[in-house]
């Protein structure tokens, strides 16, 4: 057995091609009858199918055929068009030729499917060239559903494809209409358009009216490289057919409507973008609209037709810009239900959507963002960011226009510069301190809601993890012990594995914080303190000398200490210890340990004038839980 023929088959895309003796021709030294030269399909085609002309073409894949059937043109290869464009594709069939007693022969048939080939069944070399139907006197968009050269682009390797385009050069213009690209007419001086413009829906054919004769245009299409450079590659010259349809006595056809957008309290004309019909056998003044149902966010009015709402108008009113919408309601979307008729056809329902945008928005900041000190991060909520116009704006979006200095805004654990109100409401927007050198921060956002924007500054403060408890009034003129019953950052110490530090930022107005000697034998008196640690508090090394307000009669007074507290791996926080003072009362059991009492009180009681502690705090009526300090 021997196998002759090219063993290659060229097929037009989407077509059926018979195998021929030029492609596949077997013979034997014994001159075997072609009926007895049997081919078995070992592996069928991938891009199409093999079938017999006389058998059901939708049936099962062909398994065997003879050389005689090839000679008769009965063995057909059908290419199936894929969804994705291509320029050239390759398929293979693996066959086994047998004719006992001869030894079997393996054969491979290569199939080339190419748009390059001249195809009688498919006159166009493009992915699509279907032509266009257009109503007389109207315009129609030429889209990739009608004309598509993306198969030329498919000849470029995919990594470079985005840098290429297809240039269509119009070689013969339409005789009864005009081609427009982005509303600009094509002409001899500007005869080009691109595949990308086609794909974007920018190519329009406008029929000039005056009859329904056929129209069309001729073009040459070829690849264009980066920056408009011409490149070698597939090209084709073809014609695009335009069929002009007679539209007389047809009912009006409503066109797609674009919602009218305007700001609250304003007035805007209704245009053909909102209300238009195709009805070549009716004048605009004959096409009447009637309002069936109006929304609550405004009304329609006619210029020169009084101030009140109108319920009837014509297409001519729309085309001339006389019809307007007055937005006197709230900033919500609304829909007019209309009926439209040309007076001859039954009325058709139509709708006009009106979207009222707010005239202004406000970003409401109810509270600064408080970050718990031990966590170093906190989710934003509506307390920090909420947008309102004449109503709440739940679809507001935010953009960071000035970032925080000491932290980041995170969404999903990643730094972000844009987020939505929805993400805030879900607790997904988090502020996290990354630099622990400040107890506060701020950032500025631009809020955008329905086309209107406003900016706002969000302040961030750290809430100290500090238990503060002053108890009852403290005696003026005494020195009391500052210890963990008054100030306690023990929990912060546990959470951070460090000894928290305090720095006195302000106060007290009347008095001072001092370091007291460890024992009576320790030399030196009390030292003024600006900085101390949790360890100092626990060691009982600190005292607060409570002063008397000067220049006024003795009596109760208020005072405070403002402290900055910091610890390892967390941001610092400002906290305050507010306390009341009163003249010393020896009969009163104070809730804090007194290290010394006023000199006058000691003298009166006949005590030696020394600064000896008065011992542990006296019994109290109640023992409230320590309160967590408010961050500052």
């Amino acid at each position: 057995l021997s196998l002759k023929g090219s063993q290659t088959l060229t097929v037009c895309p989407g077509s059926v091609q018979p195998l021929s003796s030029q492609t596949l021709r077997a013979s034997s030294s014994a001159g075997t009858d072609p009926q007895l030269l049997l081919y078995r399909v070992v592996r069928g085609p991938q891009l199409g199918r093999l079938f017999h002309a006389q058998q059901d073409s939708t049936g099962e894949a062909l398994v065997n055929f003879t050389q005689a059937e090839v000679y008769a043109g009965n063995i057909l290869y059908e290419h199936e068009m894929p969804p994705e464009p291509f320029w050239e594709a390759h398929d293979t069939l693996e066959l086994q030729l047998s004719s006992p007693p001869a030894r079997d022969v393996a054969a491979t048939l290569a199939v080339a499917v190419s748009f390059e080939a001249a195809c009688p069944q498919r006159p166009s070399h493009l992915w699509k060239n279907k032509g266009l139907w257009v109503p007389e006197g109207q315009r129609a968009r030429i889209t990739v559903a009608a004309l598509d050269a993306s198969n030329l682009l498919a000849s470029v390797p995919s990594p470079q494809r985005s840098e290429h385009d297809v240039l269509f050069q119009v070689t013969q213009f339409p005789s009864r209409g005009q081609l427009l690209v982005s509303e600009e007419p094509l002409h001899a001086g500007q005869p080009h358009f691109l595949q990308s413009q086609l794909a974007a829906g920018q190519l329009v054919y406008a029929h000039g009216g005056g009859g329904t004769q056929q129209d069309g245009f001729h073009f040459r299409a070829h690849l264009q490289g980066p920056a408009g450079a011409s490149v070698a590659g597939p090209q084709t010259s073809e014609a695009f057919a335009i069929t002009v349809r007679d539209v007389n006595e047809r009912p009006p056809q409503p066109q797609a409507s674009v919602p009218l957008r305007l700001t609250r309290g304003s007035r805007a004309p209704i245009s053909r973008a909102q209300l238009s019909v195709v009805d070549p056998d009716s004048a605009p003044g004959e096409i009447e609209y009637e309002v069936q149902r109006a929304p609550h966010n405004g009304f329609l009015s006619l210029v020169g037709g009084g101030l009140g709402p109108v319920t009837r108008f014509t297409q001519a009113d729309v085309d001339s810009g006389r019809l307007a919408f007055v937005a006197n309601g709230s900033s919500v979307a609304g829909i007019f239900q209309l009926s439209m008729s040309d007076g001859a056809s039954p009325p058709l329902p139509m709708s006009l959507a009106v979207d009222i945008l707010p005239s202004a928005i406000e970003v409401q900041l109810r509270a600064p963002l408080e970050v718990p000190q031990a966590l170093g991060r906190s989710s934003l909520s509506q307390q920090q960011l909420r947008v309102v116009s004449d109503r709440e704006e739940p679809e507001a979006a935010y953009r960071l226009i000035q970032g925080p200095q000491y932290g980041h805004l995170l969404v999903g654990g990643r730094p972000t510069s844009a987020f939505s109100q929805f993400q805030i409401d879900q607790g997904e927007v988090v502020f996290a301190f990354t630099n622990f050198s400040s107890s506060h921060d701020h950032f500025r956002v631009l809020a955008l809601a329905r086309g209107v924007n406003a900016s706002a500054v969000v302040n961030v403060t750290v809430r100290a993890l500090l238990h503060v408890w002053a108890g009852g009034p403290w005696p003026q003129g005494a020195t009391l012990r500052l210890d963990p019953t008054v100030l306690d950052a023990g929990e912060l110490a546990n959470r951070t594995g460090s000894v928290p530090r305090f720095r006195l930022l302000e106060g007290p107005r009347h008095g001072r914080v001092v370091r007291v000697p460890r024992a009576r034998t320790e030399p030196g008196g009390s030292q003024l303190v600006e900085q101390f640690t949790q360890q100092d508090l626990e060691d009982g090394r600190l005292g607060l000398e409570v002063g008397r307000p000067e220049g006024r009669a003795p009596g109760p007074a208020g005072d405070s200490l403002t402290l900055e507290l910091w610890a390892q791996g967390v941001p610092p926080a400002v906290a305050s210890l507010d306390f009341a003072t009163e003249p010393y009362n020896a009969a009163r059991p104070y809730s804090v340990a007194l290290l010394s009492v006023p000199e006058a009180a000691r003298t009166e009681a006949g005590k030696p004038e020394s600064s000896t502690p008065t011992g542990e705090p006296g019994p109290m009526a109640s023992s409230p839980e320590p309160a967590v300090a408010k961050g500052g």
Epitope: F436, V499, Q531, E564, Q568
Partner: nanobody, 116 residues
């Protein structure tokens, strides 16, 4: 100009040791917390060890406990990270960070490669 300068990184065999130094200038480490943070290729950052330079309190990540030791020498204004029994997974850029009253500084990092 405030600076933290790390040194002591390099290539070492598994099981070997290195001592990283973090020298501070323009501020006193005596009243700061010092931390060593590492970033391995393709991974996030990990706080390896930290120390309170006044009280000497230390903390270590589980992955380095018993192998690494952090210390402060306030006289030299320098912090150290002694790394013993090094493993391939300790390969990273090691950064020194100092945190004190209204300050938080980072060094430029030193590379440690553990490989045979």
């Amino acid at each position: 100009e405030v600076q933290l300068v790390e040194s002591g990184g390099g290539l070492v065999q598994p099981g070997g040791s290195l001592r990283l130094s973090c020298a501070a200038s323009s501020f006193n480490i005596k009243d700061t917390y010092i931390g060593w943070v590492r970033r391995a290729p393709g991974k996030g950052t990990e706080l390896v060890a930290s120390i309170d330079c006044i009280y000497g309190y230390t903390r270590y990540a589980d992955s380095v406990k018993g192998r690494f030791t952090i210390s402060c020498d306030t006289s030299k204004n320098t912090a150290y990270l002694q790394m013993n029994s090094l493993r391939a997974e300790d390969t990273a850029v090691y950064y020194c960070a100092a945190q004190g009253y209204r300050l938080h500084y980072w060094g430029q990092g030193t590379t440690v490669t553990v490989s045979s």
